[in-house]
């Protein structure tokens, strides 16, 4: 028996369902009574879901997995993982045994988009050219860790005096806070871009200082 899985990682959004595809080619006369199908975590071998001795033996993994029972006889050994969590990320092995056996691993990459950044300034009044200001760009509930970029109004990257921190919450999602310390010119726009490297999703935030008072551009 030969097991086939997708070579590319399966990318799944947090709280959605994912299908880990796995297939085998049944011989003529194949019956499910002959099938041993086991999904397990590749690294630890912890059982995830199994179908052996003609029976679906159920989910051993948070009760969030299911096979496609009607498709098994056709060689579809795919696993459905419901309500994906950050902790589900990793490699899963599909093990199929009929007379002989084979296995293959499929990778699950979990992702969550970052929120539109909110921008804050400190101090936020009586600003004058030459003042040192702290601009904070905050974006929430993303995964995996973000890449953060700052630019000025001319699109020139601002790399000095940037401090970025990322903290995971109890669900494993990251809240990003990036702080830019800059000396104000006569006027200027400062923008931050929060990028999710897996989703290739960019979330933008900016603040424009035009003499007095400062303004925030309307959200897109």
């Amino acid at each position: 028996v030969e097991v086939q899985v997708s070579e590319d990682p399966v990318v799944a959004l947090v709280d959605t369902d994912a299908t880990l595809r796995c297939s085998f080619s049944p011989e003529p006369g194949f019956s499910l009574a002959q099938l041993n199908l086991i999904w397990q975590l590749t690294d630890t071998k912890q059982l995830v879901h199994s179908f052996t001795e003609g029976r679906d033996q159920g989910s051993a993994y948070s009760n969030r997995t299911a096979l496609f029972p009607d498709l098994l006889v056709q060689g579809n050994a795919s696993l459905r993982l419901q309500r994906v969590r950050v902790t589900d990320e990793g490699s899963y092995t599909c093990f199929v045994s009929i007379q002989d056996f084979d296995s293959a691993a499929v990778s699950l990459q979990v992702a969550a988009p970052y929120s539109k950044p909110s921008m804050t300034l400190e101090p936020n009044k009586d600003l004058r050219p030459g003042n040192m200001v702290t601009i904070t760009c905050s974006s929430y509930q993303g995964y995996p860790e973000a890449e953060v970029f700052w630019k000025d109004g001319q699109g020139v990257p601002l790399t000095g005096n940037v401090t970025t921190s990322q903290m995971a919450n109890e669900r494993g999602l990251f809240d990003v806070h990036s702080v830019l310390r800059v000396v104000l010119g006569a006027n200027g726009t400062y923008s931050c871009l929060v990028r999710n490297p897996v989703l290739q999703q960019d979330a933008h935030g900016s603040v424009t200082i035009t003499g007095q008072p400062l303004t925030f551009p309307p959200e897109a």
Partner: antibody, heavy 117, light 106 residues
Framework: QVQLVQSGAEVVKPGASVKVSCKAS????????MHWVRQAPGQGLEWMGM????????NYNERFKTRVTITVDKSTSTAYMELSSLRSEDTAVYYC??????????WGQGTLVTVSS | DIQLTQSPSFLSASVGDRVTITCSAS?????MYWYQQKPGKSPKLLIY???NLASGVPSRFSGSGSGTEYTLTISSLQPEDFATYYC?????????FGQGTKLEIK
């Protein structure tokens, strides 16, 4: 016919570990789940975990997860159950049992493990 | 975990009696399994998939039920049937057993 022969009785000290073996014969060892179930004196049956010899997949009862390790040696058709950090309440008969459909259809003779200082 | 509660826990009966043991599950299960255990012996599978007789088990044993309520019936007790009986589920992990029903001679 299917036979599961377990290792002999053990007396162990609190805090120590014990490893019980279960040698299978009369069937294709790699095709069936092997379970471990224990029974304290005068008490009921408690499932500890299981392993599939072919894939090595295992699942443990959360109650024992930090203390139990179930392994197999395919070359000798033998399953092992190791329980660590033993305490007096682990005194029990430990059984290996082979799956049949969704049941444990064949059982070893049991191994008495006594935890005593 | 799915809890299985057997009733009664103790049962006194005579040879020839018809006895019924009930197993109630805290959540719905697909199948129930029944075992017999005699003192100093390993458990023996009697019934699998709720109602199917395991190999070599006499036809006086039968099982039925669905959802959360299952029963084991012995139609006419024989002297060798006095033992402890356990129900077991594998619909979800961990596998669980009932606390047992001890069947004694009246």
């Amino acid at each position: 016919q299917v036979q599961l022969v377990q290792s002999g009785a053990e007396v162990v000290k609190p805090g120590a570990s014990v490893k019980v073996s279960c040698k299978a014969s009369g069937y294709t060892f790699t095709n069936y789940w092997m379970h471990w179930v224990r029974q304290a004196p005068g008490q009921g049956l408690e499932w500890m975990g299981m392993i599939h010899p072919n894939s090595g997949a295992f699942n443990y009862n959360e109650r024992f997860k930090t203390r139990v390790t179930i392994t197999v040696d395919k070359s000798t058709s033998t399953a092992y159950m190791e329980l660590s950090s033993l305490r007096s309440e682990d005194t029990a008969v430990y059984y290996c049992a082979r799956s049949t459909a969704l049941a444990t259809g064949y059982w070893g003779q049991g191994t008495l493990v006594t935890v005593s200082s | 975990d799915i809890q299985l509660t057997q009733s009664p826990s103790f049962l006194s009966a005579s040879v020839g009696d018809r006895v019924t043991i009930t197993c109630s599950a805290s959540s719905s299960v697909s199948y129930m399994y029944w075992y017999q255990q005699k003192p100093g012996k390993s458990p023996k599978l009697l019934i699998y998939d709720t109602s199917n007789l395991a190999s070599g088990v006499p036809s006086r044993f039968s099982g039925s039920g669905s959802g959360t309520e299952y029963t084991l019936t012995i139609s006419s007790l024989q002297p060798e049937d006095f033992a402890t009986y356990y129900c077991q589920q594998w619909s979800s992990y961990p596998l669980t057993f009932g606390q047992g029903t001890k069947l004694e001679i009246k």
